[in-house]
């Protein structure tokens, strides 16, 4: 339900190919904004409601997901041990 849209390509400088990418997501009934495989996605609203963040599969394939204390977010642990933490405000 999400597509990557390229915005703001600088056409005044032909050598410059930097562009800003953004996701455009159309969620179905019962879904709201979330993260799947480290990208914007529409996810079951109940996941967000219950703060079971790992159920939306927010980490990249091969990474392990763990809930932070008080379900304030999640961590993604890479096979090499590096940990990326995401907190939800």
């Amino acid at each position: 339900t999400c597509e990557i849209v390229t915005l703001d390509r600088d056409s005044s400088q032909p050598r410059r190919t930097i562009a800003r990418q953004t996701a455009r997501c159309a969620c179905r009934k019962g879904q709201i904004a979330g993260t799947t495989r480290a990208r914007p996605a529409c996810v079951d609203a109940r996941i967000i409601k219950t703060k079971q963040w790992c159920d939306m599969l927010p980490c990249l394939e091969g990474e392990g997901c763990d809930l932070l204390i008080n379900r304030s977010g999640w961590t993604c642990t890479q096979p090499g041990g590096r940990i990326k933490t995401t907190t939800v405000s």
């Epitope: 997501c25 179905r28 009934k29 019962g30 709201i32 904004a33 109940r46 409601k49």
Partner: antibody, heavy 129, light 103 residues
């Protein structure tokens, strides 16, 4: 404070048309799914229509499908309901309502009837000859 | 169609419970007093607006939501409607309403 103010009601003739408006303030209108709900005199609440936060999706109750069009102007923070081929059974108070979830930029989100957290005071529509 | 009782009664100070079942996604509860505007007392299953007294609470169990008013007061006498999405998950639906009478 969140405020929803409906207008456009009044006495209408059967077969006629009307356009209801709901002016919103106190929140980021473009981030919320919105609803129209009606109540016939002495009766319960009835789902009429809803629209996604960006206006790309619409939905209608069976009683008005094919006769109603919901729309929104996010620049003016206004919700609309166009009703055609009016019938006596369309008589009632029409409420505008907001779904609580604040949809982030780049997303199109539906509201949820169970997530309605704010209501307007309603505008009365009477369809009679 | 949603199922909710047509009437519930309680004495002041008692606990009143109103159930609603038959929908999907989330449930809300909306209070209506004669001649007054609709007021949301519970939304998204168990969330309470900041201006609603703490005696109002909601709880979801399976596909049934229960509105509980702990320590009912005279001013709680009103009609209460539950709202959710129909079983197909494509359109909104409301219960027929429950009249709460405070004896």
């Amino acid at each position: 404070a969140v405020t929803l103010d409906e207008s456009g009601g009044g006495l209408q003739t059967p077969g006629g048309a009307l356009r209801l408006s709901c002016s919103a303030s106190g929140f980021t209108f473009s981030s919320h799914g919105m609803f129209w709900v009606r109540q016939a005199p002495g009766k319960g609440l009835e789902y009429v229509s809803e629209i996604t936060n960006d206006g790309s999706g619409t939905n209608y109750g069976s009683a008005v499908k094919g006769r109603a069009t919901i729309s929104r102007d996010n620049g003016q923070s206004t919700l609309y309901l166009q009703m055609n081929s009016l019938r006596a059974e369309d008589t009632g108070t029409y409420f505008c309502a907001r779904s609580t979830y604040e949809c982030p930029g780049g997303f199109s989100c539906w509201g949820d009837t169970g997530q309605i957290d704010a209501w307007g005071h309603g505008t009365e529509v009477i369809v009679s000859s | 169609a949603l199922t909710q009782p047509s009437s519930v009664s309680a004495n002041p100070g008692e606990t009143a419970k109103i159930t609603c079942s038959g929908g999907v996604y989330s449930y809300g509860w909306f209070q209506q007093k004669p001649g007054s505007a609709l007021v949301t007392v519970i939304y998204w299953d168990d969330e309470r607006p900041s201006d609603i007294p703490s005696r109002f609470s909601g709880a979801l169990s399976g596909s049934t939501n229960t509105l509980t008013i702990t320590g009912v007061q005279a001013e709680d006498e009103a009609d209460y409607y539950c709202g959710t999405e129909d079983i197909s998950g494509t359109a909104g639906v409301f219960g027929a309403g429950t009249t709460l009478t405070v004896l």
